[in-house]
Interface confidence: low
């Protein structure tokens, strides 16, 4: 059974009321918090989903952050820094350094590891671990779901009866975060790429650190950038042709801030698409090279584009924008052959441009076939 209440009472008796905010924080209090954290970790397996347990876990992080406790004490698992909890602390601070992830991180003499995830075209997914997949994922799917951020995409068929889909709607929920931001929702749909949150605002609300979340319109109706400095995150949303593309740069620590790995941890940017939702577009590409568009219909996961769009034309159009024959180039060819929509060339081009801007490892900008998933990997 879940023993969280035992952890609570041990902590409460150990601190005997001293956990009320105090000006002189004692090492004893921090030690009690570390013991509390250890206790919750030990009971974690049996407490999945228990409300009191999750309150306690968040509470420990919050109190450690409030009282400047190190997590590196004898009973704690060392971590680079304590990310404040995603809960609702309404206390104001005159210098909300907590609302600037990098500044806060550098105080702990470390540099955050940034990761990138992107979704574009038919749709093609580049995960935080640099896996590249082409997926069906029709309907609504979680792209990101962690303690700070929730991103959901809706994909619709690009042609009637097609297994190939593209992103027609995107919803981003920035969760209420300390003295930095109120909960904010951003929603984009086909032909509607707003430069504001759904409540009309362009920043994080009324809190001291509200400007740590900002929307900037780069190109009206076509390109929006959202900076969430409090979690060190940059998001780029574009409308290319009729459909949407998504790209994000996010610290590993935020990527992995998942409370319930059984449910939250299944999001696409982290785990990739389920095997039964993946399209082997590289085999399709090889097939296309040998057969030409005329004989593609049988092998295609989707109705092929009209015959007036031959393979050679697709290759030429993609080469024009994507001279390196990497997976973005292959994705471009796939999309042109399956949809006949030339805008997918631009989608692949901009997706690669976003990688160049957002990916921290410049050696990994181009992905090639050798990184394709092996059968059995999700």
């Amino acid at each position: 059974p879940c023993k969280i209440l035992k952890c609570n009472s041990e902590f409460w008796s150990a601190t005997s009321g001293s956990h009320a905010p105090a000006s002189d924080d004692t090492p004893e209090f921090c030690a009690a918090l570390r013991s509390y954290a250890l206790c919750t970790r030990r009971t974690a397996r049996t407490c999945r989903g228990d409300l009191a347990y999750h309150s306690a876990v968040h509470g420990i992080e919050d109190l450690m952050s409030q009282h400047n406790c190190s997590k590196d004490g004898p009973t704690s698992q060392p971590r680079l820094r304590t990310l404040p909890p995603a809960g609702d602390s309404q206390e104001r601070s005159d210098s909300p350094e907590i609302c600037h992830y990098e500044k806060s991180f550098h105080k702990h003499s470390a540099t955050p590891n940034y990761t990138h995830c992107g979704l574009f075209g038919d749709p093609h997914l580049r995960t935080f671990t640099d896996r590249f997949q082409t997926c069906k994922v029709q309907g609504a799917w979680p792209l990101i779901d962690n303690n700070y951020l929730n991103v959901q995409v809706t994909n619709t068929p690009v042609l009637p009866g097609s297994a190939a889909t593209a992103t027609s709607k995107l919803t981003i929920i920035f969760k209420n975060f300390q003295e930095c931001v109120d909960q904010k929702v951003y929603q984009a749909e086909m032909d509607e790429l707003p430069a504001a949150f759904v409540d009309g605002s362009k920043n994080g609300g009324d809190k001291h650190g509200a400007n740590s979340l900002k929307i900037t319109e780069k190109v009206s109706g076509q390109h929006v950038e959202i900076q969430a400095k409090y979690i060190g995150t940059t998001i780029v949303v574009r409308q290319v042709g009729r459909y949407l593309t998504f790209a994000v740069r996010m610290p590993e620590e935020v990527v992995n801030a998942v409370e319930d790995w059984d449910s939250q941890g299944l999001y696409l940017c982290l785990r990739g698409c389920p095997l039964n939702q993946q399209i082997d577009f590289q085999a399709f590409h090889t097939n296309a090279e040998g057969t030409g568009a005329r004989r593609l219909a049988a092998a295609s996961p989707a109705p092929t584009a009209p015959e007036t769009f031959p393979y050679e034309t697709a290759v030429a159009k993609c080469k024009e924008k994507l001279p390196v024959e990497d997976l973005y180039y292959q994705a471009c060819v796939f999309d042109l052959l399956t949809t006949g929509d030339v805008n997918f060339t631009l989608a692949a081009y901009y997706a690669l441009e976003d990688v160049k801007m957002l990916h921290s490892n410049k050696d990994k900008l181009h992905l090639y076939e050798r990184t394709r998933d092996l059968p059995g990997r999700a």
Epitope: G49, H54, S55, H58, D88
Partner: antibody, heavy 120, light 109 residues
Framework: EVQLVQSGAEVKKPGASVKVSCKAS????????ISWVRQAPGQGLDWMGW????????NYAQKLQGRVTMTTDTSTSTAYMELSSLRSEDTAVYYC?????????????WGQGTLVTVSS | QSALTQPRSVSGSPGQSVTISCTGT?????????VSWYQQHPGKAPKLMLY???KRPSGVPDRFSGSKSGNTASLTISGLQAEDEADYYC?????????FGGGTKVTVL
């Protein structure tokens, strides 16, 4: 806008059961617990229990154990509270409330309330 | 009989301060970091005013403040206004139970 919308008023006979629904919108339903609280006419608030929508875990007030059942349907973001073997003292306004996430145990968003009248 | 004891009523003139106490045991209040306060106007649902003893949700005026000493938590309304006339309930999460106070009627004279 975060909202909890409850089902309409009910009139029940003693011994019967009542099931009150509470539909959530404007937030991720599985990220917050749901508490149920009741208030008899002219009386104070009385906690009945809570449920965690993503695990189904429940915690009921001792005095209602065996009579109350709380459930959720995550596909419709709806929480339900069923009270059986009704008696006249169960006449009350029943509220659902969202339990705030994070380190604090509090109820930050409330439904409008559902009046349940138990009368023969 | 509520597990947390509150005065039945308190009153004050506009602009004055009033304090509502909420007394429990060491386990229900003294050792609990989970004390919250709710305001309820007649015929309306309760509204969260303070949580974690002292914290104010956004939208709640700063004339509402909280404190705790020993086994007693307190809600203070400074600069009382007509719209503050309502019932106020303290709540504590102690172990497996959520405990409500009996409620205090605040009257603005």
């Amino acid at each position: 806008e975060v909202q909890l919308v409850q089902s309409g008023a009910e009139v029940k006979k003693p011994g019967a059961s009542v099931k009150v629904s509470c539909k959530a919108s404007g937030y991720t339903f599985t990220s917050h617990g749901i508490s149920w609280v009741r208030q008899a006419p002219g009386q104070g608030l009385d906690w009945m229990g809570w449920i965690s929508p993503y695990s189904g875990n429940t915690n009921y007030a001792q005095k209602l154990q065996g009579r109350v059942t709380m459930t959720t349907d995550t596909s419709t973001s709806t929480a339900y509270m069923e009270l059986s073997s009704l008696r006249s003292e169960d006449t009350a306004v029943y509220y659902c409330a969202r339990v705030g996430s994070g380190p604090y145990y509090y109820m930050d968003v409330w439904g409008q309330g559902t009046l349940v009248t138990v009368s023969s | 009989q509520s597990a947390l004891t509150q005065p039945r009523s308190v009153s004050g003139s506009p602009g004055q301060s009033v304090t509502i106490s909420c007394t429990g045991t060491s386990s229900s209040v003294g050792d609990s970091i989970y004390v919250s306060w709710y305001q309820q106007h007649p015929g309306k649902a309760p509204k969260l005013m303070l949580y974690d003893v002292t914290k104010r949700p956004s939208g709640v005026p700063d004339r509402f403040s909280g404190s705790k000493s020993g086994n007693t938590a307190s809600l203070t309304i400074s600069g009382l206004q007509a719209e503050d006339e309502a019932d106020y309930y303290c709540v504590s999460y102690a172990g497996t139970d959520t405990l409500f106070g009996g409620g205090t009627k605040v009257t603005v004279l």
